[in-house]
């Protein structure tokens, strides 16, 4: 029957940061198309980007629904032109994905550091709340809304003149840190999950600097 | 829907172990907190601590380190706190609850307990 | 380790509004303590209210919520029923550890 000339696809893998999640898979096709489904463990299978030439499937608009199920793709191959045809056992050529789940998986974005404020010998800094594609009540929620007591801020900051560098942790989006009068200081973040085995931490943000224009400097 | 079942009543003698049990039904076990709460009477809810089955993480109250032990199966779906060096103060029930933690955070199923008595 | 204090006894009629608070030893009670309201009734049955400060369990009645008053978490009863009658506790979460409260043992008559 159809199997001649369709192949199966092979490296499908997960993509995901901050939720949103796109599954890839290859190869290029030549003389075919794919479609995909994803499902839950206990759910119906949901078909997805139908027929497409793509190497790819967005689907954040699924795993969205609930970020802390595992879920499941696979990718479907048929003939171009000729989408009804089968394979020998009656059914299309297709793949599974590994499992996926989400909350566990997507990986962290990298952070921003909002503004700092110097006020003394204390300077306050803080993470923009990032905006995530997972929704509540038509909302979109930030990362610490659904991740809550699961995600900290580590903070790198550092004397423009020197390179030694001092840490920080916060399980909220501000870090109040001593700084020595009259010296600039440079900041970086990172984001973390310290409950995961995999994609525990972010990259770090870019670097802010005093000095620049992001900081409010007050002599009190 | 959500349940969390525990093991039965436990008699044990001084210096021994205990191992509870909390099988959960109805969601993605590995997905959520499991958290550990003893009560005695007159003495309210103490926490415990907390297992992530997904990674096995756990984070301990300092007075029970060295006295519990969490693990996880996520082939089962089962949760396990482990009571070691037992003495008349660990005589108590031990609950489990699922930490629906995020944006709707709350504990918000529990298991029926597990009657703990350590008597010689 | 933090204390976290209730009030060990309330009483308040049915209909009336009453609220439960509690205190951190250790400062302000904030978002990111997440605040966790339990009741408990006879049998040993527990059930969560309210978590994450003011976010309704599903299936709790809306005369339960959960709020930031001055330097407090406080659990609002309004228009309180006799089936309300219960002991309440909280939770408040301090980087890596949960701290309960000692509860509020609440009648309703």
């Known amino acids: 029957s159809g199997t001649t000339n369709t192949v199966a696809a092979y490296n499908l893998t997960w993509k995901s940061t901050n939720f949103k999640t796109i599954l890839e898979w290859e190869p290029k096709p030549v003389n075919q198309v794919y479609t995909v489904q994803i499902s839950t463990k206990s759910g119906d299978w949901k078909s997805k980007c139908f027929y497409t030439t793509d190497t790819e499937c967005d689907l954040t608009d699924e795993i969205v629904k609930d970020v802390k199920q595992t879920y499941l793709a696979r990718v479907f191959s048929y003939p171009a032109g000729n989408v009804e045809s089968t394979g020998s056992a009656g059914e299309p050529l297709y793949e599974n994905s590994p499992e996926f789940t989400p909350y566990l998986e997507t990986n962290l974005g990298q952070p921003t550091i909002q503004s700092f404020e110097q006020v003394g010998t204390k300077v306050n800094v803080t993470v923009e709340d990032e905006r995530t594609l997972v929704r509540r009540n038509n909302t979109f929620l930030s990362l610490r809304d659904v991740f809550g007591k699961d995600l900290i801020y580590t903070l790198y900051y550092w004397k423009s003149s020197s390179s030694g560098k001092k840490t920080a942790k916060t399980n909220t989006n501000e870090f109040l840190i001593d700084v020595d009068k009259g010296e600039n200081y440079c900041f970086s973040v990172q984001a973390v999950i310290p409950s995961r085995t995999v994609n525990r931490k972010s990259t770090d943000s870019p670097v802010e600097c005093m000095g620049q224009e992001k900081g409010e400097f007050r002599e009190i | 829907q959500v349940q969390l079942k525990e093991s039965g009543a436990e008699l044990m003698k001084p210096g021994a172990s205990v191992k509870i049990s909390c099988k959960a039904t109805g969601y993605t076990f590995s997905s959520y907190w499991i958290e550990w709460v003893k009560q005695r009477p007159g003495h309210g809810l103490e926490w415990i601590g907390e297992i992530l089955p997904g990674s096995g993480s756990t984070n301990y109250n300092e007075k029970f380190k060295g006295k519990a032990t969490f693990t996880a199966d996520t082939s089962s779906n089962t949760a396990y706190m482990q009571l070691s060096s037992l003495t008349s103060e660990d005589s108590a029930v031990y609950y489990c609850?699922?930490?629906?933690?995020?944006?709707?955070?709350?504990?918000?199923?529990w298991g029926q307990g597990t009657t703990l008595t350590v008597s010689s | 380790q933090a204390v976290v204090t209730q009030e060990s006894a309330l009483t308040t009629s049915p209909g009336e509004t009453v609220t439960l608070t509690c205190r951190s030893s250790?400062?302000?009670?904030?978002?990111?303590?997440?605040a966790n309201w339990v009741q408990e009734k006879p049998d040993h049955l527990f059930t969560g209210l309210i978590g994450?400060?003011?976010n309704r369990a599903p299936g709790v009645p809306a005369r339960f919520s959960g709020s930031l008053i001055g330097d407090k978490a406080a659990l609002t009863i309004t228009g309180a029923q006799t089936e309300d009658e219960a002991i309440y506790f909280c939770a408040l979460w301090y980087s890596n550890h949960w701290v309960f409260g000692g509860g509020t043992k609440l009648t309703v008559l």
């Open positions: 994450g400060t003011n």
């Open positions: 250790t400062g302000a009670v904030t978002t990111s303590n997440y």
């Open positions: 609850a699922r930490d629906r933690n995020g944006y709707v955070n709350y504990f918000d199923s």
